[in-house]
Interface confidence: low
Amino acid sequence: DSSKWVFEHPETLYAWEGACVWIPCTYRALDGDLESFILFHNPEYNKNTSKFDGTRLYESTKDGKVPSEQKRVQFLGDKNKNCTLSIHPVHLNDSGQLGLRMESKTEKWMERIHLNVSERPFPPHIQLPPEIQESQEVTLTCLLNFSCYGYPIQLQWLLEGVPMRQAAVTSTSLTIKSVFTRSELKFSPQWSHHGKIVTCQLQDADGKFLSNDTVQLNVKHTPKLEIKVTPSDAIVREGDSVTMTCEVSSSNPEYTTVSWLKDGTSLKKQNTFTLNLREVTKDQSGKYCCQVSNDVGPGRSEEVFLQVQYAPEPSTVQILHSPAVEGSQVEFLCMSLANPLPTNYTWYHNGKEMQGRTEEKVHIPKILPWHAGTYSCVAENILGTGQRGPGAELDVQYPPKKVTTVIQNPMPIREGDTVTLSCNYNSSNPSVTRYEWKPHGAWEEPSLGVLKIQNVGWDNTTIACAACNSWCSWASPVALNVQYAPRDVRVRKIKPLSEIHSGNSVSLQCDFSSSHPKEVQFFWEKNGRLLGKESQLNFDSISPEDAGSYSCWVNNSIGQTASKAWTLEVLYAPRRLRVSMSPGDQVMEGKSATLTCESDANPPVSHYTWFDWNNQSLPYHSQKLRLEPVKVQHSGAYWCQGTNSVGKGRSPLSTLTVYYSPETIGRR
């Protein structure tokens, strides 16, 4: 049943003498494995023998016999699926029909494949897109119906016989559907490629030429133009004539229209290849080009810049920057339309020519107030001198100048006075808008630039003001020189350094912290009595009677100031001791008698000692000696001794008389 055999392979294979043929082939024998395979060249069926006659190129049988031809022809298939064949090398006489005789256990089949072997390598075929336009990428394809594993080939692209720089992509196909080698080249043709020859060259593995195909490029492009101008530099003066000529160097297809453009705008009624401009004016300066169109589109020439020369126009001045700050830099630019550009400039400041300034720009590195004013300029080129324009105003701004603080009061100023100061300045730009004062205080500013200090303090030494516009300028501080009575008057003991003892030399100093004016007088006072008029009060030998409350006064022309009262304390040993008796120096026995040791001492007596008429000390140490009851034997002379931290003092003797009572007299 022949329907059981299914084959797939290319219908015809192409090769050339000495190359090789690779025949991709698959089959399916549904009733079992292949048992016998014979490759015939131009097989003919013999009805008599019921067998095929023809040249046997390959034979694979059960007994394994292989003809000598098998070295050239190889069956690369298997027993159930693959029937791929290779003939290497292939010869011209291999052209014709190849017959694959297949036999399985029960079935037979003859499959025919066409083989076309040429004497020489056949050329590849170049495929081009239907239309090629400049700068549009196209793909050029070179196709060759050949590929064989045993015979490597390459396809190379040439432009006018020179290898093309663009990288080509080569692909091969060796499948049951098709056998080919293909090279694809992406290429952006330019107008200059029009008419050029492109070649696809077939080469062997060593780069040896085998065959080729050529095509001529038909690149559609806009007209390519050249513009020529008389005079050639396109520089003329007003009133001259200019001729421009447009030449078409290439156009595909042929051009249809011509026009001229100035600054991108079409010139009316100018549709020939020559543009004549007679008696040109400066307004005709500009970029000229010609435009020629074809079916692809318009082409433009390079632009010619026509320069119509003229004398400078009235100039204007541009200032960078106004207003300018004093000390900053300023640049002036003289602007004047002229062709050619001006070569010389004359500058004016407030109508007066500025010497040595001949450039387009004037640079002043450090602006001063006197630079303010109107700046104008005149431009000059080879055709003449322009007119001076209106000029530009430079405003120079600066902080207030020569600021001074002025005291309005009559001098001298006394503590407690109301002081008025004004802040004055010489000049300012912009105007002064505010004032500042140092130091800050709760002071009045009755009007701009005036300061009123009520009840001025003795310590208000200096005041400074600043006049402010955009900046503040400070005046030098002004001294108020406030006059005041002496301050902080106090009594200070100079000597001795320790406490004052009776008999010491003592010096007291009248101190004060400050006085304005400095000339002063001193007064010492004790208990309202004037003691001296020096800064010091001296005691050669102090006595307890000098103790008391002292004050000093310091006078200047403004007033006088007293110190706080200062207490002078004199330390001395007990003195003026005496023994007093109570109720008297005659006491009746049995009564009570009290002896008191009286003294004058500073500090007070801290310790008392009592003595009798025998200078015998008694065991009593308090100020009072109490005898109760008093006896006649107590009669006699007594004295006491007082002690303090300074020393000791003793009293004179005092006699106590104790007389008998009536009872005692009565008993006798």
């Epitope: 600054d263 300066s285 500009g286 970029k287 080009c289 082409g299 433009r300 020439s301 390079e302 632009e303 810049f305």
Partner: nanobody, 124 residues
Framework: QVQLVESGGGLVQPGGSLRLSCAAS???????MGWFRQAPGKEREFVAG????????YYADSVKGRFTISGDNAKNTTYLQMNSLKPEDTAVYYC??????????????????WGQGTQVTVSS
């Protein structure tokens, strides 16, 4: 007075895009406009140029395929579209104009007018 004013610069991450514009003010003429750049401590180098007559463009090898120069001759404006930006593109970008035809478009000395420059920083 001719003035060229650039805009569009700024900070962008690597791989990002920016579009620079350059507007020419005043009544004047030009043959071509170009973009140059100057990185810190390096010389000013050509980036791209455009010839108005046929919109022909020119590029430095380092920016080919990433930068595109275009323009509007009627408005005297040129644009530089910068894609796939790299840290080495960091520079001050200057716009320049050829008032008269002076030949090669990648030579600084052939340009008559220059802008003040716009900073382009490419950093993550």
């Amino acid at each position: 007075q001719v003035q060229l004013v650039e805009s569009g610069g700024g900070l962008v991450q690597p791989g990002g895009s920016l579009r620079l514009s350059c507007a020419a003010s005043g009544s004047w003429f030009n043959i071509a406009m170009g973009w140059f750049r100057q990185a810190p401590g390096k010389e000013r180098e050509f980036v791209a140029g455009i010839r108005w007559s046929d919109s022909k463009t020119y590029y430095a090898d380092s920016v080919k395929g990433r930068f595109t120069i275009s323009g509007d001759n009627a408005k005297n404006t040129t644009y530089l579209q910068m894609n796939s930006l790299k840290p080495e593109d960091t520079a001050v970008y200057y716009c320049a104009a050829q008032r008269y035809y002076r030949g090669s478009y990648n030579r600084q000395t052939n340009y008559d007018h220059w802008g003040q420059g716009t900073q382009v920083t490419v950093s993550s």
